[in-house]
Structure formats: structure tokens, C-alpha cells
């Protein structure tokens, strides 16, 4: 029988009446078009909905947009279009919502052809009021808030000017011309690339990387011959053109660009690319594209300086620059990432790592599933997960994998069970232990979301026909109840719940179609009466993350420590609540060779935990360029994995000596870097 249909499933009592009393319909008085939805702040209940409708006329496009606001998590909406003077809002810029709980919103308006600049509407009170501001430039990008100070905004203009505002968009100043890309760093620092000759495209590989730490009063050139740059965790990366040819290399800085080191990564040619897949303050996952149009490359993981890299995964699927990769950080369990590889036979397979890229394996076959037609051996196969690539290929996959940091261990994804990803209609699978084991949760494709930190999972069938039924589970997807939320089915377009998975409200969006018109409609369901009491201590049970062998003293040790969590019992139907904090108890592990990566000049042979010297470097002094100085490395081949907290046990020796020699590693040395002030 399908999951949740056997007799052992405990029914939630009287749920139909409870949900009926907490289902709120809102019909939007618009012609259909497009709709975008944004949450303003955290736990505020404020939602902004922008509907836009385009009518292509012979010589121009006539557009109309409406703005709606809810302050009760979508149960009721008020038309506030008059607050923005009934202006047409440009949807390609979306709604720029300020960081944290600043309550700031910026909407970019469509203006007529001949105007001197663009127009924005600004709110700093969670969209209760808006101020119209005419800009001295036409914006090319959405306004970007400084993560540290939501009053500081930056934007690029259509003429490649870099504009900054220090008073939340009231007054704007152009701080630099000829800018290609700009990003906020930490401490209100702005990094940007500039071109000298023709344009961003023409100067690609000859751009300069600049930094301003005082919002444009003074500048420092921190790099030349730049192709592109990126920020990840505490690392600043730049891909730099080599002197002699058209190849580029990654350089890395951990001091905001004052000093640079060449990353020990392969160089790439014109048609190849680098991509930061994930980064934190400890390390980075870097994808390096293979030469030729292969659609794959190699994942490397960095040391704590972002300089020494270990090969992590071969044949990693990544189609083109800015293309599709399935690389997914499983946020519900530390150290877990899922991605896809392209096999020699061109089939796509899913791989998972539980130790931040140290080792990759196939996903264990779900116990309640059969191997499909892709499997050579009907008893031995794996689960393969559909993610961005499958979605881009228009397979019947409505959603990417889902995990939430406060729903510990839970991962939900579409998948197929065989030797490779199948093009057949997928089912939905769930893991409650961060990806070690999986169970089929729902038959066929579904939209899904996590509420109340995992206390409720909600799903809606993906169908081309109108729908009126929602499914929910209070036991991490084991048993499902169905609820008919409306008598009149709607064409479903999306599920919306407050980011962070702490809410107990879900909004079902769609449209109704009649003979002459179609209208947007939303149904917001509050599950608070299903989870009618607050969870108590007895509702939680102890779980050791990454446990594979209870008899092993090091069971659960990942990156040098293990963590016990308090997890909600599957049988407990109660509210974690909005203030729920994950309870965890870490304990340090003894060091083993698994806690170290291979140092510069060393590598790990397959299926071996020992690091051995690279043959081509045997007997040579290990000298490399670091922060613009020649360094001499004395090592027995090991360096602690970034973020690893192990103590005692194995302790390999390592020493770095400064050779007091200068080296520039194809890059500006600090002495040559120039500064200027406005």
C-alpha cells in the first residue's frame, strides 16, 4: 500500500473541522498575469504581493500592477496600490526586502522613455507607508542592501555607473563609472570590477578589481587582469588572466584583497569556468570545469586559507557557466551535501557526502522501494535525486530538494530508484537522518514544505488539472491526512510559507478560470489547532547525528566531533512553536587521519587514508607563494580539515617557514597596489 495508507496510521482527531475554521480565502481583483510574493521581516506576518498584467499593443506594452499587503500571514490582504500612486512596478527587479527585521522595502517603478532617471518607492515600516523617490540614474540591477546597515544601498545604472545611497535611497551619489559587477563585502565594504577601454564584455580578463571601505570616499585597486570575482564565507576570490596565454587562475584573499595567494587549482581556458558551489568561514567547495563542452568538471575542497585544495569529486555535473548543477547543501545536518555526477555512459547519478566532501557515496536504496528499469541488478541499486538539472530539462519535477536547519535530519526530495536518474515520473522520498536512509513518502510528484520546524509537512500533488486537496503529515511523512480546502478546484501555481519553517501557516496560490476572466486566489491554512498543545520535554527523543555503528567508540564523529540532538518524537502531535531552538550536545572526538586533508604536494590514493608525496615533487623542496612571499613547507603531508574540532589521537607535524623572498604569482604584489581618494 502507498505510504500513509496502512491501518497503523494514527488519524489526527477532528482535523477537518479544525482546518475548516482556519482556512482563509482571498480572491484578488485582478486579471491574471504574473504574481510575486515577498515576506517582510521575520515573524511579522507581513506579506507583500505584487500582481502585474501586460497587454502587448502594436507599438508598446501597456502594463498594470497592483500591490497587496497582509499582516496576518496571508489570511487577509489589503489593496495598497494607492500607496505607490498606482504606478506600474517592474517585476524583473522584484521587491527588494531589507535584511533581518529592518522592515525596509524598495520597489522599482517603470518610467516613460524620455525620463532623466528611474523611480523607486521606499518603505521602512514594513510597507505601511511608501515614499516616492526619483533617481538620478536608470537602474540596471535591483537595489542591494548592505548586510551590516540597511540604510546603505548600492545599484548599477544602465550606463555602468556605481551608485550608492547612505540614507535608504533618499539621496544617491555616483561613486564610480565603468563598473561591471559590484558586491557588498563585510563591514560595509564594496568590491567592484571596472573596465578601462570599451566595455565589460570587451575588457573581460583585463578588468580591475577595486575596493572601497568608506562608501566611495577612497578606493584601492586590489587586482588587475581580472576576469571575474566572487565572495564566499570569509574568502574573496578572483579569476585572473595568466601573463602568457588565455588561461586564468583563481587567486584568493582572506584580508579583503590586501594580500593574495594563488589557489592550488588547475587553470582554466577561455571556454571553461570556475564556480564557488558553497562556502563558509572554514572552507570552500570549488567546481573547476573540464576542457571542452563536457558538461562536467571536478569539485575541489579547500583548506582553511582557501589555498590548498583536495580533489573531492570527479565528473561533477555542471552544464555551462551559470548553467545547472544539482549541488545542494543539506542544511538539516552538518557536513552533508548532495550532487550529481555524469557517468561514462552519460547517465546521471546522485552522490552524497556526509563529511564535507571528504568521501562521496551513492544514496542508500529506500527499504520500501523496488529498483527501476535503469538497474542492471534488480536487488542492488541506489536512490537518485532530482534537482536543478532535472527541473531545467523539464522533467516532471516541481521542486528541488528541501531541508531546513531547524528541522534536524529531515530531507525531502523527488527521486527514482535504480542505477541512474530516470526520466520516468518520480516519487517523493524523505530522510529523517540527514540522508543516510530514505523512505518513499508520496507517490508521484508533489510540491512540499516544512512547517513548525518539522512538526508538520505539507504537500500538494503536481497536476495539470485543477486541485482542491492538500495533504499533511505530523510524523515526518510516515502517515498522511488529506484535507479539501475548497469546493471549487483551482489551477495551482505555488505553495508559500514563511522562510525559516517556523510558521504554522501555508498559503496555496492559484487562479480560477471562468468563461471570460481568470483571477488570482489564495487559500491560507493555519495548522495551529491541529497541533493543539505546546511540546514538552517528554515529546522529544535523543538522536545522535551521523551514527552508523553504535558499537564503535567514534560513532557519529564527523569533522572531529559528534552531536546529540533532541528531536521531536514522530508520535508527538504538538507545537514546537516559533521560539523553538534546536537542542544539541556536542562532544569532541579523538583525531584520526580522517581528520586531516593532504597538504600541498601530497595526495591520497583511492581507498587509503594516508597521504603520500606527489611523485613529481619527491625530493624537491616544497616552496610556494603565499601572501606575496615565498614559503618553505616542512610537512609530513597532513593539514587539519577546516572546521575539524578533534583533539588528541593522531597528530601529524607541520611547519611553514617564511623564505623572505618576494613572489607575485602572476598577480599584483601589495607594494604595487595603488590607492586613491575622491
Amino acid at each position: 500500500s502507498a505510504p500513509g495508507e496502512d491501518e497503523e496510521c494514527g488519524r489526527v482527531r477532528d482535523f477537518v473541522a479544525k482546518l475548516a475554521n482556519n482556512t482563509h480565502q482571498h480572491v484578488f481583483d485582478d486579471l491574471r498575469g504574473s504574481v510575486s510574493l515577498s515576506w517582510v521581516g521575520d515573524s511579522t506576518g507581513v506579506i507583500l504581493v505584487l500582481t502585474t498584467f501586460h497587454v502587448p499593443l502594436v507599438i508598446m506594452t501597456f502594463g498594470q500592477s497592483k500591490l497587496y499587503r497582509s499582516e496576518d500571514y496571508g489570511k487577509n490582504f489589503k489593496d495598497i496600490t494607492d500607496l505607490i500612486n498606482n504606478t506600474f512596478i517592474r517585476t524583473e527587479f522584484g521587491m527588494a526586502i531589507g535584511p533581518e527585521n529592518s522592515g525596509k522595502v524598495v520597489l522599482t517603478a517603470e518610467v516613460s522613455g524620455g525620463s532623466r532617471g528611474g523611480r523607486i518607492f521606499r518603505s521602512s515600516d514594513f510597507a505601511k507607508n511608501f515614499v516616492q523617490t526619483d533617481l538620478p540614474f536608470h537602474p540596471l540591477t535591483q537595489m542591494m542592501y548592505s548586510p551590516q546597515n540597511s540604510d546603505y544601498l548600492l545599484a548599477l545604472s544602465t550606463e555602468n555607473g556605481l551608485w550608492v545611497s547612505k540614507n535608504f535611497g533618499g539621496k544617491w551619489e555616483e561613486i564610480h563609472k565603468a563598473v561591471c559587477l559590484a558586491k557588498w563585502g563585510s563591514d560595509n565594504t564594496i568590491f567592484f570590477t571596472t573596465y578601462a577601454n570599451g566595455s565589460c564584455k570587451a575588457d573581460l580578463g583585463a578588468l580591475e578589481l577595486w575596493r572601497t571601505s568608506d562608501l566611495g570616499k577612497s578606493f584601492k585597486t586590489i587586482g588587475v587582469k581580472i576576469y571575474s570575482f566572487g565572495l564566499g564565507g570569509r574568502f574573496l576570490f578572483a579569476s585572473v588572466m595568466a601573463d602568457k596565454d588565455t588561461t586564468r587562475r583563481i587567486h584568493v584573499s582572506t584580508d579583503q584583497g590586501d594580500t593574495w595567494s594563488m589557489a592550488q587549482l588547475p587553470s582554466v581556458g577561455q571556454e571553461q569556468f570556475y564556480s564557488i558551489l558553497a562556502a563558509n568561514d572554514d572552507m570552500v567547495f570549488m567546481h573547476v570545469d573540464e576542457p571542452g563542452d563536457t558538461g562536467f568538471g571536478t569539485i575541489f575542497t579547500s583548506d582553511d586559507r582557501g589555498i590548498v585544495y583536495s580533489k573531492s569529486l570527479d565528473r561533477h555535473l555542471y552544464t555551462t557557466t551559470g548553467g545547472e548543477t544539482d549541488f545542494t547543501n543539506v542544511t538539516s545536518l552538518r557536513g552533508v551535501y548532495i550532487t550529481s555526477v555524469l557517468s561514462e555512459d552519460n547517465s546521471i547519478q546522485t552522490m552524497i557526502t556526509f563529511d564535507q566532501g571528504g568521501r562521496w557515496t551513492h544514496l542508500r536504496k529506500p527499504e520500501n522501494s523496488e529498483c527501476d528499469a535503469t538497474a542492471k541488478n534488480k536487488n542492488e541499486c541506489s536512490l537518485h535525486i532530482h534537482a536543478s538539472y532535472s527541473i531545467s530539462q523539464k522533467l516532471n519535477v516541481p521542486m528541488a530538494p528541501l531541508s531546513e536547519p531547524n528541522a534536524v535530519g529531515i530531507v525531502i526530495a523527488h527521486g527514482s530508484v535504480g542505477d541512474a536518474i530516470s526520466v520516468m515520473v518520480p516519487d517523493v522520498y524523505i530522510s529523517d537522518d540527514g540522508g543516510y536512509s530514505w523512505t518513499k513518502m508520496l507517490e508521484g510528484p508533489h510540491y512540499y514544505t516544512i512547517l513548525d520546524s518539522g512538526g508538520i509537512i505539507v504537500a500538494i500533488e503536481h497536476s495539470s488539472r485543477p486541485i482542491n486537496v492538500i495533504k499533511f503529515s505530523t510524523d515526518e511523512g510516515q502517515c498522511w491526512q488529506t484535507y479539501t480546502f475548497t469546493r471549487d478546484p483551482i489551477y495551482f501555481t505555488g505553495l508559500a510559507s514563511e522562510p525559516g519553517a517556523r510558521s504554522m501557516n501555508i498559503s496555496i496560490w492559484g487562479f480560477t478560470e471562468s468563461f471570460l476572466t481568470s483571477q488570482w486566489v489564495s487559500y491560507t491554512i493555519d495548522f495551529k489547532d491541529i497541533l493543539e498543545r505546546n511540546c514538552e520535554e517528554k515529546d522529544y527523543t535523543i538522536w545522535l547525528a551521523h551514527s552508523t555503528d553504535p558499537e564503535d567508540y567514534e560513532d557519529g564523529c564527523i569533522l572531529g566531533y559528534k552531536e546529540q540532538f533532541l528531536r521531536l518524537r514522530k508520535s508527538s502531535v504538538c507545537q514546537n512553536g516559533r521560539d523553538y531552538v534546536v537542542t544539541k550536545q556536542p562532544s569532541i572526538c579523538l583525531c584520526s587521519l580522517e581528520d586531516f586533508l593532504c597538504d600541498f604536494g601530497y595526495y591520497r590514493p583511492e581507498n587509503d587514508s594516508k597521504c603520500v608525496e606527489q611523485p613529481e615533487l619527491k625530493g624537491h623542496d616544497l616552496e610556494f607563494c603565499l601572501y606575496g612571499r615565498e614559503e618553505h613547507l616542512t610537512t609530513n603531508g597532513y593539514r587539519k580539515i577546516p572546521g575539524d574540532k578533534c583533539q588528541g589521537g593522531v597528530n601529524p607535524v607541520r611547519e611553514v617557514k617564511d623564505l623572505k623572498k618576494k613572489c607575485t604569482s602572476n598577480f599584483l604584489s601589495p607594494e604595487k597596489q595603488n590607492s586613491k581618494s575622491n
Partner: antibody, heavy 124, light 107 residues
Framework: QVQLVQSGAEVKKPGASVKVSCKAS????????MHWVRQAPGQGLEWMGW????????NYAQKFQGRVTMTRDTSISTAYMELSRLRSDDTAVYYC?????????????????WGQGTTVTVSS | DIQMTQSPSSLSASVGDRVTITCRAS??????LNWYQQKPGKAPKLLIY???SLQSGVPSRFSGSGSGTDFTLTISSLQPEDFATYYC?????????FGGGTKVEIK
């Protein structure tokens, strides 16, 4: 092999306290919950609570709340159960028992290793 | 607290007999039910965990079934060493509770 060895029999007066020890060997002591279960003469089994050796956190049955204290010393792989304000109906055999684990889950799978039991007699 | 009701409280059987003991929970406990065997003067011994999983080292003549509220322990062919008291125990919700026991005696 995996075993739990408990301290010897005790005779106590009403109102006194008793502290029973349980030394674990043959397995990773912090890796499992330690439960305490008692059995009055001719009666069934009664669960008293457990201790998590990793954190020292405890879960006591409501009936014993305020009278029972469970502690552990991980350096010597030993768990302790102290019962205070003893009454004559506390006369029983007291068992420590290791909670069986299913990979990461600590509860729900019974108690797979038991101590030999400690007889506590409360009599004036 | 969840009440666990075992039946019968005692039974007489002969070697080779098929013996069935039932256990009912006062509310659903999913599959979080365990069975123990206890002989006089000895500590209990885990036979079945999670309603139907056989603990390692336990003879295959012991089996468990059920989920929700109704559970069964079956001894397919009673052996002389099986004469003992059997307890069910729920571990779904704290506090953990045991059934009153079923004493299996020689007929």
C-alpha cells in the same frame, strides 16, 4: 563481552537513602542510555528513569521525581541511582539496563543488556 | 501514562505447543513495543524489539507482530527453557510502561 555489574545488596531504614552503582564494560559507555528499572517481590517491572551519559541529562518517571537522582562518571564507565526518603514499599530488586539503539535513535528499542540486580530492603 | 494490558496473566502449555500472548496499549504506540522474558531470580532478557524485530541471539521460534495498539508475541514450538514470565513494554512515550506479565507454566 558487554556486561553491567551492579553493587551489592543493601538494607536501609525508612527515611534513609540508597545509592546503587552500575559499572559498564565491553562497550562505549557514552553511546547508550542507562535505564533503571525496579521489581518489588512477586511484582512486575517498573521503570524509574534514564540517564544520558554524554550530557548527564535525565528523564525520571513522575512517580520518582524529587526522590531519585541518576548520575554517571564516564571516566570509570559507571552509572549511579540514588533513591532518598526510602519507604518500606521501595523494597525491590533494582536493575540498571542499557537502552538498545537503532543507529542514531536512543529510545524506542527496548533494553538489551541488564545488570544482575541489586536487592534493596527497607525495614525498620 | 500509557497502560499496557497483557493477556492472559498466566497460561499452562506443553513442550511443542504454539503459544500466543497479547498486549494492548491504551493508545497508539506505533511499533514501539518490546517483549522480555524473565526467569525467577534473573534479570529480564530482551526477545523482540520494535514490535517484530528479533534480538540477536534469540531463537527464531519467537516472533512478534502488531502495530498501533494491539501486539502479539508468538512462540511457535514451546521448549523446556521457555517456561518463564513474559513482559511487554512500550517505549513510544515517556514514561516507559510495562505490561503486568504473562506466566507460562508447564501443563
Amino acid at each position: 563481552q558487554v556486561q553491567l555489574v551492579q553493587s551489592g545488596a543493601e538494607v536501609k531504614k525508612p527515611g534513609a537513602s540508597v545509592k546503587v552503582s552500575c559499572k559498564a564494560s565491553g562497550y562505549t559507555f557514552p553511546g547508550y542510555l542507562m535505564h533503571w528499572v525496579r521489581q518489588a517481590p512477586g511484582q512486575g517491572l517498573e521503570w524509574m528513569g534514564w540517564i544520558n551519559p554524554v550530557s548527564g541529562s535525565t528523564n525520571y518517571a513522575q512517580k520518582f521525581q524529587g526522590r531519585v537522582t541518576m548520575t554517571r562518571d564516564t571516566s570509570i564507565s559507571t552509572a549511579y541511582m540514588e533513591l532518598s526518603r526510602l519507604r518500606s514499599d521501595d523494597t525491590a530488586v533494582y536493575y540498571c539496563a542499557r537502552g538498545k539503539r537503532s543507529s542514531g535513535w536512543y529510545e524506542g528499542y527496548g533494553m538489551d543488556v541488564w545488570g544482575q540486580g541489586t536487592t534493596v530492603t527497607v525495614s525498620s | 501514562d500509557i497502560q499496557m494490558t497483557q493477556s492472559p496473566s498466566s497460561l499452562s502449555a506443553s513442550v511443542g505447543d504454539r503459544v500466543t500472548i497479547t498486549c494492548r496499549a491504551s493508545q497508539s504506540i506505533s511499533s514501539y513495543l518490546n517483549w522480555y522474558q524473565q526467569k525467577p531470580g534473573k534479570a529480564p532478557k530482551l526477545l523482540i524489539y520494535a514490535a517484530s524485530s528479533l534480538q540477536s541471539g534469540v531463537p527464531s521460534r519467537f516472533s512478534g507482530s502488531g502495530s498501533g495498539t494491539d501486539f502479539t508475541l508468538t512462540i511457535s514450538s514451546l521448549q523446556p527453557e521457555d517456561f518463564a514470565t513474559y513482559y511487554c513494554q512500550q517505549s513510544d512515550v515517556s514514561p516507559i510502561t510495562f505490561g503486568g506479565g504473562t506466566k507460562v507454566e508447564i501443563k
